[in-house]
């Protein structure tokens, strides 16, 4: 059995209203029926109607239909507004424009091309002819009005009342002609109601063909009437759901208007060094998501491929690799340059409502001079002068005490990760504040990445580890417990210290963690002389975007032959290229009899920008990353590896040099693993040891 | 975020739904499932974390298992009952771990009869 | 376990007055209180999150106060619009967890 076409995408609805007849005349009939959809289905088919149906009446109340023979249009009738009541138009009697050959017009223009009136349809004067509305019922040959019967190319045409001129086309314009739209056409509430390849769309009221989430009810403010194209969600041009079952969407076919300017209403107010609401006006030049990730340009396709471009979005200001928000997303954002990480946003923004001053420092922040006192948990600073000993106690210089005023947030000690102030609560005894470099600022905190200036290896005799490794050289591997089973790796550097990665902290409950020390399988079966449990007391959280944690333990860990802690580098060292290192971890290993013992993968250093070329342009590494490839391919860090360490060989001394954390893939073949670089945060984790009380053995 | 799956099943057909991700990265946000029965209020399933570890309400325990891809969170019911017939949310998580959740899926219906 | 109590469970409130709801967690969560709205045959709404920070886009008519075990949202010059049922959600840890979310106010404007 065929399926009968829904044809109330034909129509176009006016809620709440309902025509009265006030010419006594004009006919109208009734029925009782469910739905609005069967009052549109007959009034198409004009099935038992003694007239051509152009309209229809839905009493959702008494669930009746009134067909009728006019519209809104038409002489003698008014609209009445009525809240049981919603009207329904055939879209062809009151469109004044074509869709592709105009077969479907029904409209009253009735001039030619070149302004001859038209001869009416049932008169044989001044031309004989063969198209009697008789002959040709359903194609609406009514008075003298353009018609296309047949289909036929050029559109609507008549027969001319000049006796001279049989027949002429009629200058009617297609609807894609008459239709246009500003900017990528949010703002469009325009009348196309089909797609660039023909097909009808579907209404934004019905659920069928296809189910969607622009519900009309749910967004007022998205001018979802009928079935019209319309741009909810900021695509490139309007849209719409097609009656197509195979084909979901596709984008209209609207050109954009001669005079491409925005109502007053559109424009979101802009700002260039804040953001305010959604950022959606946000024209500064900040250029890299808020971990530091540099921004990928609107205008390439790589590394990642989009339609975000600025010839699809004209209005948005997609220049060069800036955040923007062109699609009301929560903030502005951008494609990013890592090719495992495909948009991020740019959080780093202040908000415009948020500035404290001067909120931005240039370099690591060692002169900046705002009024900001606040730390980034909400923490009050405490006044310079009461804490002056503490200062002393880890700078080896004296501080500029006219820099130190009031309770403000300033870096004296300078230190590489901004501006700090201390707190007065012991638990936290200094914190950084929230303040962002200023935008365009690129200063390096450590210059020369890829030559080796300072060694990594704090003295070249300190200790010696002869022949293979054994489980005696792993005592300072750490499995991070979360509700009693292995979520993550650290490594033990300090007695009451374990360095990992935030993202092993899913909850803010330290009684749901605890740390296993000493032990070789992830569940301690055979480990129970040497195993050591240690509850956590705090989490120290790292520079903003370092991803690192320094993680405190409840006790000292008692070092022994099983447990032992890990050096750390030089601040700001370089480790050469082709160092040999490995990666520990109890985490995913691919096999399906995984026997829960700590394995290594064996990875040697690469330079930043080999780096990038192994990861084909896409990436590119900054300051605080390393970088390290597989000596076997697809060997290398994975889920369950995650804060584990990177650990590298130099003069004899073994350091933990990087941090394994989330978002680079798991062990990709031919792709070098990207680590935190533990170089660059050694003095942030020195100060850390040096400031914060940890409980006596 | 946008949910996909639901269906009406029998009780005890195994049933998977979907939550594709776009616009940001699961290597940045946790995901969770939330479930709403008509006329009820909203109950939190389970939630995947950046690192790839789950945690379930204790009546989910058992009940549900989510797992993930590079863009997708599912969420298995491996033997449905007709106490499972709800709208099914996902949302994404503030930040890698536990935290509110700052968007939301327009949900899928699931309905379990027999 | 941490989980949240909400009372009332239905409020009627004139145009223009101020709602008052609360939420309580079954042992401390610091902070970590988030508020939602939600209308019907719509997903819910991020209101407050950090039980008081309002989130992005939201009217200043809303408002969240506590910390510890006791919350509140507040709907001040309440508006027609303002009509749906509103949940608190914890944000802390969810350990042992039967539901994150509270059992919901609905808020009914007359």
């Known amino acids: 059995q065929r399926k009968r076409r829904n044809t109330i995408h034909e129509f176009k609805k006016s809620a709440k209203t309902t025509l009265i007849k006030i010419d006594p005349a004009l006919k109208i009939k009734t029925k009782k029926v469910n739905t609005a959809d069967q009052c549109a289905n007959r009034c198409t088919r004009n099935k038992g109607l003694p007239f051509t149906c152009k309209a229809f009446v839905f009493d959702k109340a008494r669930k009746q239909c009134l067909w009728f023979p006019f519209n809104s249009m038409s002489s003698g009738v008014k609209k009445e507004f009525g809240h049981e009541f919603d009207l329904y138009e055939n879209k062809d009697y009151i469109r004044n424009c074509i869709i592709g050959k105009g077969r479907s017009y029904k409209g009253t223009v009735s001039i030619t091309k070149s302004g001859i009136k038209c001869q009416p349809w049932s008169s044989m004067i001044p031309h004989e002819h063969s198209f009697l509305p008789s002959s040709y019922r359903g194609k609406d040959l009514q008075e003298n009005y353009c018609r296309n019967p047949r289909g036929e190319e050029g559109g609507p045409w008549c027969f001319t009342s000049n006796p001279e001129v049989r027949y002429e086309v009629c200058d009617i314009p297609q609807c894609s002609e008459v239709e246009c739209m500003t900017c990528n056409g949010e703002s469009y509430r325009g009348l196309m109601d089909h797609t660039e390849s023909g097909k009808i769309c579907q209404r934004w009221d019905h659920q069928t063909p296809h189910r969607h989430k622009f519900l009309p009810e749910r967004y007022p403010d998205k001018g979802f009437d009928d079935n019209y194209c319309r741009n909810p969600d900021g695509q490139p041009r309007p849209w719409c759901y097609t009656l197509d079952p195979h084909t979901r969407w596709e984008y209209c076919a609207i050109k954009t208007c001669a005079d491409n300017t925005m109502n007053d209403t559109d424009v979101p107010l802009e700002t260039t060094e804040c953001i305010q609401g959604q950022g959606e006006g946000y024209r500064g030049t900040v250029n890299t998501i808020w971990n530091g990730i540099p921004c990928q340009r609107w205008d390439s396709q790589y590394p990642h491929e989009h339609d975000m471009t600025p010839e699809n979005f004209k209005c948005k200001d997609l220049r060069e690799n800036y955040c923007r928000n062109p699609d009301g997303s929560e903030s502005p954002w951008c494609f990013t340059t890592d090719p495992n990480i495909r948009v991020g946003y740019c959080s780093q923004i202040p908000n415009c409502d948020m500035s404290h001053g001067q909120d931005c420092y240039r370099g690591n922040g060692k002169n900046y001079m705002g009024n900001l006192s606040q730390t980034r948990s909400g923490l009050t600073c405490s006044m310079w002068d009461k804490n002056m000993e503490d200062l002393h106690r880890h700078i080896f210089w004296e501080p500029d005490a006219s820099k130190l005023n009031e309770n403000y947030c300033r870096n004296p000690d300078d230190d590489a990760h901004g501006p700090w102030c201390y707190t007065g609560n012991p638990l936290i005894p200094w914190d950084y504040c929230p303040i962002s470099r200023c935008e365009g600022d690129t200063t390096p905190t450590i210059v020369n990445l890829d030559h080796p200036v300072i060694s990594c290896a704090k003295t070249k005799q300190l200790r010696v580890v002869n022949g293979i490794p054994t489980r005696t050289n792993i005592g300072w591997m750490v499995s991070l417990r979360y509700r009693n089973k292995h979520i993550c790796g650290g490594s033990l550097i300090k007695e009451s210290w374990v360095l990992t990665a935030r993202q092993c902290f899913p909850s803010r409950d330290l009684k749901d963690y605890e740390a296993w020390l000493g032990i070789h399988d992830v569940h301690g079966r055979g480990d129970e002389k040497c195993k050591q449990v240690l509850n956590v007391s705090q989490l120290v959280y790292g520079p903003e975007g370092s991803d690192l944690v320094l993680m405190k333990l409840a006790r000292p860990a008692v070092l022994d032959d099983f447990v032992s802690t890990i050096d750390l580098p030089n601040y700001g060292c370089t480790i050469p290229e082709k160092t040999s290192c490995s990666v520990y971890g109890w985490g995913y290993t691919g096999l399906i009899n995984y026997d829960g013992l700590l394995r290594v993968a064996h990875l040697y250093i690469m330079g930043n920008e080999k780096c990038s070329q192994h990861h084909r342009g896409k990436v590119t590494l900054n300051e605080s990353e390393i970088c390290a490839g597989a000596e076997k391919i697809g060997s290398g860090p994975c889920e369950g590896d995650y804060g584990g360490p990177l650990v590298c060989e130099q003069h004899k001394m073994r350091m933990v040099l990087g941090v394994i954390v989330p978002g680079r893939g798991c062990a990709i073949p031919n792709r070098p693993g990207i680590f935190v670089r533990v170089a660059y945060y050694a003095k942030w984790i020195h100060k850390i040891i040096l400031t914060y009380k940890v409980p006596q053995s | 975020v946008e949910e996909s799956g639901g269906r009406l099943v029998m009780p005890g057909t195994p049933l998977t739904l979907t939550c594709t991700v776009s616009?940001?990265?699961?290597?940045?946000?946790?995901i969770s499932w939330v479930r709403q029965a008509p006329e009820k209020g909203l109950e939190w399933i389970g939630v995947i974390y950046v690192i790839g570890v789950t945690d379930y309400a204790s009546w989910a325990q058992g009940r549900f298992t989510i797992s993930k891809t590079s863009t997708t969170v599912d969420l298995k019911i491996p033997s449905p009952t007709t106490e499972d017939t709800a709208t099914y949310f996902c949302?994404?998580?503030?930040?890698?771990?536990?935290?509110?959740?700052?968007?939301w899926g327009p949900g899928t219906l699931v309905t379990v009869s027999s | 376990a941490y989980d949240m109590t909400q009372t009332p469970a239905s409020v009627e409130v004139a145009v223009g007055g101020t709602v008052t709801i609360k939420c309580q967690a079954s042992?401390?969560?610091?902070?970590?209180l988030a508020w939602y709205q939600q209308k019907p045959g719509q997903p819910p709404k991020l209101l407050i999150y950090?039980?008081?920070k309002l989130a992005s886009g939201v009217p200043s008519r809303f408002s969240g106060s506590g910390s510890g075990t006791q919350f509140t949202l507040t709907i001040s010059g309440v508006e027609c619009a303002d009509a749906a049922t509103y949940y608190c959600q914890q944000a802390y840890s969810v350990a042992n967890v039967d539901n994150a979310f509270g059992g919901g106010t609905e808020v009914v404007v007359k």
């Open positions: 949302a994404r998580v503030y930040d890698s771990g536990w935290n509110h959740f700052n968007l």
């Open positions: 616009g940001f990265s699961l290597s940045s946000n946790a």
């Open positions: 042992q401390s969560i610091s902070s970590w």
């Open positions: 950090e039980a008081s």
